[in-house]
């Protein structure tokens, strides 16, 4: 997960945009990525970075937990 997020974040050269990506990776079981992104007011660049990283992180976590279930963990 960390490796993939670092790969995505590396393309954002504006520090705030990069941090928006990292914010998207934080676990939040109560809201979707879209719901969380809707509260961002600093600009579309942040929304885009947040959403991309949030979605990728969610997908990777889902895949990992699915693998764990298959392995009977």
């Amino acid at each position: 997960l960390q490796e993939k997020i670092e790969e995505i974040a590396a393309k954002y050269k504006h520090l705030v945009v990069k941090k928006c990506c990292y914010d998207g990776v934080r676990i939040n079981h109560d809201e979707t990525c879209e719901q969380r992104a809707a509260r961002i007011s600093v600009g579309p660049r942040c929304v885009k970075a947040f959403t991309e990283c949030c979605v990728v992180a969610s997908q990777l976590r889902a895949n990992n937990s699915h693998k764990d279930l298959q392995l009977g963990r």
Epitope: K11, K13, L15, V16, V42, G43
Partner: antibody
Framework: QVQLVQSGAEVKKPGSSVKVSCKAS????????IHWMRQAPGQGLEWMGY????????NYNENFKGRVTITADKSTSTAYMELSSLRSEDTAVYYC???????????WGQGTTVTVSS | DIVLTQSPASLAVSPGQRATITCKAS??????????MNWYQQKPGQPPKLLIY???NLDSGVPARFSGSGSGTDFTLTINPVEAEDTANYYC?????????FGGGTKVEIK
């Protein structure tokens, strides 16, 4: 209407520090990044750094080698720029500006003249 | 850091003529199809004023005689026709990455 009002002119001795304020009004202070630039007499614009008041995130121009600190007080909608170890070359007009959409500076403060002289 | 090179450093133009200023970036300021290049006008004793953002978008209240073009590394600010009140310094600025950087400026004088 959006306004950025800066503190008044300062005269400082070499080696001392200066702290310039930038009071924002007419918009939600935490929604936009505040940048600081400076302009030496007859010269161009030099970017110093910024703060995102909502999160307290900052980034600085490495040319200032740790001499600059940018802070923000959300309760008063004011950003501050402190420059330490002043030298004569720091004599300049210092500007704060709001960055809109993480793209461009749409509003600027009126500028604060800082003179460093022994 | 992205270096922005403006040319010419100064130019004198007659009223009614066209003024063209170029800004060349040391690397592309395009990110996912969006050009993070802006232009500002600065008159003596005043802070800079936004003219053009995202390479070609005119800020509100800016006269239509100002226009911006370009993409990637090469950008142009055009004033056509030039008026007496356009005497000022003009700066390009990129916001695609930190540190944000400005061009060295172009001084426009009216003959």
């Amino acid at each position: 209407q959006v306004q950025l009002v800066q503190s008044g002119a300062e005269v400082k001795k070499p080696g001392s520090s200066v702290k310039v304020s930038c009071k924002a009004s007419g918009y939600t202070f935490t929604d936009h990044i505040i940048h600081w630039m400076r302009q030496a007499p007859g010269q161009g614009l030099e970017w110093m750094g910024y703060i995102y008041p909502r999160e307290g995130w900052t980034n600085y121009n490495e040319n200032f080698k740790g001499r600059v600190t940018i802070t923000a007080d959300k309760s008063t909608s004011t950003a501050y720029m402190e420059l330490s170890s002043l030298r004569s070359e720091d004599t300049a007009v210092y500007y704060c500006a709001r960055e809109r959409n993480l793209e461009y500076f749409d509003y600027w403060g009126q500028g604060t003249t800082v003179t460093v002289s022994s | 850091d992205i270096v922005l090179t403006q040319s010419p450093a100064s130019l004198a133009v007659s009223p009614g003529q066209r003024a063209t200023i170029t800004c060349k970036a040391s690397q592309s300021v395009d990110f996912e199809g969006f050009n993070y290049m802006n232009w500002y006008q600065q008159k003596p004793g005043q802070p800079p004023k936004l003219l053009i953002y995202a390479a070609s978008n005119l800020d509100s209240g800016v006269p239509a005689r100002f226009s911006g073009s370009g993409s990637g590394t090469d950008f142009t600010l055009t004033i056509n026709p030039v008026e007496a009140e356009d005497t000022a310094n003009y700066y390009c600025q990129q916001s695609v990455e930190d540190p944000h950087t400005f061009g060295g400026g172009t001084k426009v004088e009216i003959k």
